[in-house]
């Protein structure tokens, strides 16, 4: 019996087609992805093959103005239109709190939403009961397939799930649910979830009875043969893991942003064992036409976005200096504003020991593309912020050793004075450079804001200590020459859309007046 699994993950609000790098589509003939194009391909496969499941491994939420405005209603609507068969909860599904998941998505989805390792407690338990499930048995043709879900246990550090959801260890939580499916005579089981490729492989290895793992979170691109676009494969598709009980378990992921549709064919024997698996992600490029009905609907929904982008978010009573003449040479108040917003967006998980889990921000000055003039009645709009941060990136959370941070700050000024983009703006950091010294030895003082303290204060950076830092995904991926961050980071979790982070902060503060205050000397 043959099953076709179509899968997406980490779509992050890319409802419209995008450019090849998943930013805003400029030249339509070269654009990719989007739900209208995805629909065309999915329908084509459904017409051609009998047993097709369409699955999503989480993080539909967060990433473009679509999510900012529609807050998840757009996800439910277009996933319903595509007739998804199941979705696993990702960490970003909790970005607007549990209410922001329940109302627009859980209550409106016409498909099961899954996670076996999230347990509700207290008053939330009855409110959310039945709205998401640990697993679902789906009839497919004349057979049944069990889908069991999982979500990153780091979600409380990455999003806003509140205090009434407990995120258990994935493997510990999955095993009893898989065992339950086995007792229900379900012998074909897919683990669908959002914990990253390393955890996906562990699940394949450790959870007895899981036949296939469909993952997300790490934006992993797998491919067999010559890859069709810019993404470099992290391994073959499917990636085969030998389980502890000797089975060959295919593990798949489909990069991110709706650029590819994962396509996996699995052949099962009559006892539900995987005999063979093969496939590849399908690049959703312009050779696949956008479905006219979905496209027309996208255009209808778009109208509200255009109106939103010119509305006032808040006011500034000072000039927001985002000029390259400032931000690539010295501390600039636009850099301070953005870093303060980045930290504010990550205020979560305080306890008796820690006032917050992260206190530091770094931001390449070259990523700040425009100032905002306060003389326009002080008005700040989404449109203004899109000029400051035009690349559609995210502000991510990484863990780095102090020694890596020191290298990053040396890199920041290694060729100072040439108006290059790597000059770092900061938050929760005081850095002093001596530019008379030779490159690679210019950082003379580097103090960082404590987190394990009741009164935050600046202490000298310790080379062997592990620190959490918020930074643009561009830097986490080694951009602007920050190869040491990419090579030495100990953990990397994708965060929220850059413009959204700053706009939320401005809306919250209502009136802003960031200063140049001696963070960089």
């Amino acid at each position: 019996w043959e099953l076709t699994i179509l899968h997406t993950n980490d779509v992050h609000s890319r409802l419209e087609q995008t450019s090849e790098d998943s930013s805003k589509c400029v030249n339509a003939s070269r654009c990719m992805g989007g739900v209208a194009r995805l629909f065309t391909k999915v329908q084509q496969i459904r017409r051609a093959e009998p047993n097709v499941l369409l699955l999503d491994a989480g993080d539909q939420y967060q990433g473009t103005i679509w999510f900012t405005v529609y807050k998840g209603a757009e996800v439910a609507h277009f996933m319903n239109a595509l007739r998804y068969d199941a979705m696993a909860l990702g960490n970003h599904e909790f970005d607007n709190g549990v209410e922001g998941l329940i109302e627009p998505l859980l209550k409106e989805a016409k498909f099961p939403i899954l996670s076996a390792n999230i347990k509700a407690k207290g008053p939330l338990a009855s409110q959310i009961s039945g709205l998401y499930l640990p697993y679902k048995v789906l009839p497919v043709g004349d057979e049944v397939v069990g889908i069991v879900g999982y979500t990153s246990k780091e979600t409380p550090f990455l999003s806003n799930p509140g205090t009434n959801l407990v995120f258990e260890d994935e493997i510990t939580a999955l095993q009893p649910e898989v065992d339950k499916l086995k007792t229900l005579n379900v012998n074909k089981i897919i683990a669908l979830g959002h914990s990253g490729f390393e955890t996906d492989k562990l699940i394949a290895q450790k959870v007895r009875g899981v036949d296939v793992v469909v993952g997300g979170h790490s934006n992993t691109f797998l491919y067999t043969g010559n890859p069709p676009s810019k993404e470099v494969p992290a391994g073959k598709y499917p990636f085969i893991v030998t389980s502890d009980d000797g089975r060959k378990v295919p593990v798949v992921q489909a990069y991110a942003f709706g650029k590819y549709l994962g396509y996996l064919k699995i052949e099962f024997d009559e006892r539900g064992n995987v005999i063979s698996s093969h496939g590849n992600p399908i690049l959703l490029n312009s050779s696949i036409p956008e479905d006219p009905s979905i496209k027309a609907d996208i255009n209808k929904w778009r109208i509200k976005l255009d109106n939103y982008s010119t509305q006032e978010l808040g006011k500034t009573i000072v000039y927001l200096d985002g000029s390259s003449q400032s931000c690539r040479f010295r501390e600039c108040n636009m850099g301070n504003l953005i870093c303060d917003a980045m930290i504010n967006n990550n205020l979560r998980h305080a306890d008796e020991m820690f006032w917050n889990h992260v206190s530091m921000c770094i931001l390449n000055g070259g990523g700040i593309r425009s100032p905002i003039d306060e003389r326009n009645n002080g008005t700040i709009t989404w449109e203004n912020l899109a000029a400051v941060l035009p690349f559609g990136g995210t502000f991510d959370l990484v863990q780095l050793k102090g020694s890596t941070l020191k290298k990053a700050f040396e890199h920041s000024v290694h060729r100072y004075g040439q108006s290059t983009g790597e000059f770092l703006q900061v938050g929760g950091i005081h850095v002093v450079y001596d530019l008379s010294r030779k490159p690679g030895d210019r950082v003379v003082k580097l103090d960082v804001l404590c987190t394990k303290c009741r009164v935050p204060s600046y202490d000298p950076l310790k080379m062997d200590e592990i620190y959490k830092v918020i930074l643009p995904n561009f830097l986490a991926n080694g951009g602007d020459g920050f190869q040491m961050i990419k090579d030495e980071l100990l953990r990397h979790d994708s965060g929220d859309q850059d413009i959204n982070v700053v706009s939320t902060y401005i809306s919250k503060m209502k009136v802003i007046y960031p200063a140049v205050e001696g963070r960089i000397k």
Partner: antibody
Amino acid sequence: QVQLVQSGAEVKKPGASVKMSCKASGYTFTDYNMHWVKQSHGKSLEWIGYIKPHNAGTTYNPKFEGRATLTVDTSASTAYMELRSLRSEDTAVYYCVRSDFLYWYFDVWGQGTTVTVSS
Amino acid sequence: DIVMTQSPSSLSASVGDRVTITCTASSSVSSSYLHWYQQKPGSSPKLWIYSTSNLASGVPGRFSGSGSGTDYTLTISSLQPEDFATYYCHQYHRSPLTFGAGTKLEIK
């Protein structure tokens, strides 16, 4: 043109089962979900559930779960509904209905199958 | 479940009258997923208005629909003989899909 043609009227005894059919034509059968709706005499409409013809995935109204079974034969572009353990209150007209995929309205209705349950 | 309450349950009116039928949802429904059907005796229901205000193909312009949140209306600006029928509202914003009990429009 797009149409749904349903099987003829049925008379059944309480406790029996009935299986009715709905033949689709004029469109690609797998592209649209097929719903089933009950209408008792002089009464309103009651949703039973729907099936995705491309993979036979089903969603039921909890009220009918376990007693109604929806299936398809894609090669014949035909949907079926079986209703088991019939009782007198199952006497009704049953419609198969195609739904729009964007806003889920019912744009094409079958002519209905009348089921009478009587001892 | 979202309960759809239609009022009135029946209505006697004359040709040329302006008629309004209301449908109230027990909790908020997106206007995109609120639809109306017309049914005449011995026939299957027909899609009449979809997504609150869009007339289905072949529906005369004297019909209109409006509303948001929990309150929706179907209006006939000038009643014609062929409009006497039963009208049902329907939501599939949230599962399970539900219908109103119907409004029967009769000749006075």
